[in-house]
Interface confidence: medium
Amino acid sequence: EVEKTACPSGKKAREIDESLIFYKKWELEACVDAALLATQMDRVNAIPFTYEQLDVLKHKLDELYPQGYPESVIQHLGYLFLKMSPEDIRKWNVTSLETLKALLEVNKGHEMSPQVATLIDRFVKGRGQLDKDTLDTLTAFYPGYLCSLSPEELSSVPPSSIWAVRPQDLDTCDPRQLDVLYPKARLAFQNMNGSEYFVKIQSFLGGAPTEDLKALSQQNVSMDLATFMKLRTDAVLPLTVAEVQKLLGPHVEGLKAEERHRPVRDWILRQRQDDLDTLGLGLQG
C-alpha cells in the first residue's frame, strides 16, 4: 500500500508522458489522477515504467474501479495486464474481440497463464458460445485451446465455428472431446463433395462411430495410418477386413507396422485368420 502524500508543487501530471518514469512511487501515487490514467491508458505501453511503477498505476486503477475495470480501460492495459490476478479479471466484462486480441498479444509466445485462462473464460461466458471469430482468434494464439476445453464447454461450440478449426488445433484432444466435436464437424461439412469432405472431416474422425467409418470405406478416401490410429477402438472393431482395406486404400500395408498397437491390435484379434491372410501382410490374429 502506497502512503497518501501531497503532490509536490509543479509535479501534478496532466498527461501520461515519459516524464513520469522519473517519478518515485509515492510521487506517482500523489501526482497522477486515476481518471486521467484511465483515459490515457493507451500511452502507458509506450513508456518504459518499472514493474514497481506499474504496481502503483494498477493500484490507482483498482481504487478508481473497485468493481472491475471498464472495457475502455481493459483494451489498453497492454503490459499492465501481466500485473492482473485471476481475481481481478473475474470482475471484468469483456465483450469485444478486439479487447481479447489486444490482451492475448501481450501474452504472446508464452504458455497460457491463469490470467489468460480466466480472461478467455470470462469472454466466452459473456458471449454465451464459442463463435467462429472467437475460436479463430483463440486457436491462432493457442493452437491447443480447443482441446483444453471440457466436453461440456465444447458442447456450446456452434457447428459454424468448426470451419475455423485447423488440424493442429485438435492434436491434443482426447476421445471424449472428439466425441463432442465430430457430430458438429459432420453437420458443418455435410454439403461438401466426397473428397473435399474427407479432407475437412479427417481431423475429427477420432469421434466417428462405426457406421460413419463404414460409409467412408465406400468412398475411396485412402485414409492414412496416422488418422486410422486415432480412431475410437470401439468404432474400428466391427469393421470387416474388406472395409478396412477399402478405407485405407494403398495405406493398408501400414497395418503391419502397427500390429502391436491399438486399435490395430484389438481389431486384428477380432478377425478370422482367413480374412487377414487376404491382405497378404502376415498379420496374425
Epitope: G10, K11, A35, L36, A38, T39
Partner: antibody, heavy 117, light 112 residues
C-alpha cells in the same frame, strides 16, 4: 468534431446563484479537463479553475474559491459551474474550454451573466 | 501568481506587413517534464477565443504557417509574417505551467 455548447445568457439578482452548463461532443469527455474562464471588459481573461470529469477532481483559482463550484455529469457529457452569492463583480462572460494538457484548445461560445437589481 | 506582461497593447499593421507581439512571464514556464506550456490565443471581435499555438511553437491544425511562436524560459514572441484582414482581433498569451493559469492582458491587432 470537438464542440462545447454553453447554456444561454442569464440575468440575475444580487445574492442569487446561477448554474452554467457546458455540453461536450466529439471527444472522450472524461479524458480531458474542462477549464472555466471569466472575461470582463477591462479585466481581460481570468482562469477560474478546472474539473476532470472522469474522477471529479477539481482545482480552483484561490480567488474564486467559495464563489465557483464545478461538477460534471459523464452520462450526459456535461460540465457545470455554479456561481453563488452573486454581486455586480460577477457580471461577465464565462467560457468553458477543453483543457488539452496545459492549454485550452477548444472553447465554448460563452455565457453572459448579468447581475442587476 | 505568475504575471504575464504583453506588449504592445495595440498594434496597427498594414495588410501584407509583418507583426510581432511579445509576452514575458514573471517566472520560468519550463515545467518539470521538460515542456514549456506557453500558448497563444486569438479572440476575434464578438467571438470566443481560439487557440493558435501551444507549447511555445506548435501550430494548431488549420492555423496558417504565417504564424510562428518562439521563446523559452520567460520571454516569448508571436510573429505574423504577412498580416491578413482575418488576423484582426485581440491576441493573448496564456501560461499553463503554474497554478493558477494566467493570461496576458492582450494585444489588439488593428488593420491600418
Amino acid at each position: 468534431e470537438v464542440q462545447l455548447q454553453q447554456s444561454g445568457a442569464e440575468l440575475m439578482r444580487p445574492g442569487a446563484s446561477v448554474k452554467i452548463s457546458c455540453k461536450a461532443t466529439g471527444y472522450t469527455f472524461s479524458a480531458y479537463w474542462i477549464e472555466w474562464v471569466k472575461q470582463r471588459p477591462g479585466h481581460g481573461l481570468e482562469w477560474i479553475g478546472e474539473i476532470l470529469p472522469g474522477s471529479g477532481s477539481t482545482k480552483y483559482n484561490e480567488k474564486f474559491k467559495g464563489k465557483a463550484t464545478f461538477t460534471a455529469d459523464t452520462s450526459s457529457n456535461t460540465a457545470y459551474m455554479q456561481l453563488s452569492s452573486l454581486t455586480s463583480e460577477d457580471s461577465a462572460v464565462y467560457y468553458c474550454a477543453r483543457g488539452d494538457y496545459y492549454a485550452m484548445d477548444y472553447w465554448g461560445q460563452g455565457t453572459s451573466v448579468t447581475v442587476s437589481s | 501568481d505568475v504575471l504575464m506582461t504583453q506588449t504592445p497593447l495595440t498594434l496597427s499593421v498594414t495588410i501584407g506587413q509583418p507583426a510581432s507581439i511579445s509576452c514575458k512571464s514573471s517566472q520560468s514556464l519550463l515545467y518539470s517534464n521538460g515542456k514549456t506550456y506557453l500558448n497563444w490565443l486569438l479572440q476575434r471581435p464578438g467571438q470566443s477565443p481560439k487557440r493558435l499555438i501551444y507549447l511555445v511553437s506548435k501550430l494548431d491544425s488549420g492555423v496558417p504557417d504565417r504564424f510562428t511562436g518562439s521563446g523559452s524560459g520567460t520571454d516569448f514572441t508571436l510573429k505574423i509574417s504577412r498580416v491578413e484582414a482575418e488576423d484582426l482581433g485581440v491576441y493573448y498569451c496564456v501560461q499553463g505551467t503554474h497554478f493558477p493559469f494566467t493570461f496576458g492582458s492582450g494585444t489588439k491587432l488593428e488593420i491600418k
